[in-house]
């Protein structure tokens, strides 16, 4: 484990606040949960709940923790080594092409189609044509049958920032 560097060991114009934990970089890199000081002499811990780093790094700043938006639930909080994990609320999902917001899942499939996949936090309900079995493009239908879907059981987070 890296030895702690005392404040006296640091260049006088690069000393940090005493409350920050410090250790030596290994081959110019700092471990997850830390960033490197600007004089390259030591590793400074990220602040729990405020910022984080996930890999060995030479970051001058730890990465800012994500705040879950309204319409999202927090699956796990931000730690010094892992960003917050946010997930769309039940009945909503986040698509790859519109990751900035959770969208409401459709309540049913268009005429001539059947539901083969439930609403999950990362996908809308899935519809296929009754005859051919080909998937529907996903556009909101003009007319919907009264085939309703129940929200799927969350299996993994839809948005893993960081």
């Amino acid at each position: 484990e890296s030895a702690l560097i005392t404040q006296q060991d640091l260049a006088p114009q690069q000393r940090a606040a005493p409350q920050q934990k410090r250790s030596s970089p290994s081959e110019g890199l700092c471990p997850p949960g830390h960033h490197i000081s600007e004089d390259g002499r030591d590793c400074i811990s990220c602040k729990y709940g405020q910022d984080y780093s996930t890999h060995w790094n030479d970051l001058l700043f730890c990465l800012r923790c994500t705040r879950c938006d309204s319409g999202e639930v927090e699956l796990s909080p931000c730690t010094t080594t892992r960003n917050t994990v946010c997930q769309c609320e039940e009945g909503t999902f986040r698509e790859e092409d519109s990751p900035e917001m959770c969208r409401k899942c459709r309540t049913g499939c268009p005429r001539g189609m059947v539901k083969v996949g439930d609403c999950t936090p990362w996908s809308d309900i899935e519809c296929v044509h009754k005859e051919s079995g080909t998937k529907h493009s996903g556009e909101v239908p003009a007319v919907e049958e009264t085939v309703t879907s129940s929200p799927g059981t969350p299996a993994s987070p839809c948005s893993l920032s960081g």
Partner: antibody, heavy 117, light 108 residues
């Protein structure tokens, strides 16, 4: 004695490019984060970009993101700023500075970048 | 981004007087990452104070820094003729790094 010497400034047309250099001496260059700070005529200081000692991490002001690239050659003790798609508002004296977050403890004398048609 | 607002914009004082310069941040800044600089016409800035209150190498003890959170102060206890200049605060608490707009200390 720490010394920072900028070069590469000059007159360029809007949309043009320039590459600034900063030759460093008097300290272990590869250990230190380095920055570029600019000052438009008669205006205040504006941080432009910073880079970690190894060059693995870089940071930019929103005003230059996507147009400017900071880099360093630790074997030559030199810091660079590649400036593309230059605009009138980029006209300034550009300073190379040692450090980043805690302080800029040493500064170069500056190099003037003029953007005009 | 953290906006630093310096006041007053201009301070007109006589040599020997005390100068008090303020730097207010739009959100909390870690004291470790608050610095003050002096700049004279045609010259590069010079570091005065780092870590909110630590004097840089070679800076006279008439310069002192204080404050925490969102309010920081640079004090020059007795103005010398060479102290008339523009002073800037700077934060590195979170990116982007930002400077205040400056306070000009001029001779009254």
């Amino acid at each position: 004695e720490v010394q920072l010497l900028e070069s590469g400034g000059g007159l360029v047309q809007p949309g043009g490019s320039l590459r600034l250099s900063c030759a460093a001496s008097g300290f272990t260059f590869s250990s230190y984060a380095m920055s570029w700070v600019r000052q438009a005529p008669g205006k205040g200081l504006e941080w432009v970009s910073a880079i970690s000692g190894s060059g693995g991490s870089t940071y930019y002001a929103d005003s230059v993101k996507g147009r400017f690239t900071i880099s360093r050659d630790n074997s030559k003790n030199t810091l660079y700023l590649q400036m593309n798609s230059l605009r009138a508002e980029d006209m300034a004296v550009y300073y190379c500075a040692k450090g980043a977050r805690v302080s800029f403890d040493y500064w170069g004398q500056g190099t003037l970048v003029t953007v005009s048609s | 981004e953290i906006v630093l607002t310096q006041s007053p914009g201009t301070l007109s004082l006589s040599p020997g007087e005390r100068a008090t310069l303020s730097c207010r941040a739009s959100q909390s800044v870690s004291s470790s990452y608050l610095a003050w600089y002096q700049q004279k016409p045609g010259q590069a800035p010079r570091l005065l104070i780092y870590g909110a209150s630590s004097r840089a190498t070679g800076i006279p003890d008439r310069f002192s820094g204080s404050g925490s959170g969102t309010d920081f102060t640079l004090t020059i206890s007795r103005l010398e003729p060479e102290d008339f200049a523009v002073y800037y605060c700077q934060q590195g608490s979170q990116p982007p790094i930002t400077f205040g707009q400056g306070t000009k200390v001029e001779i009254k």
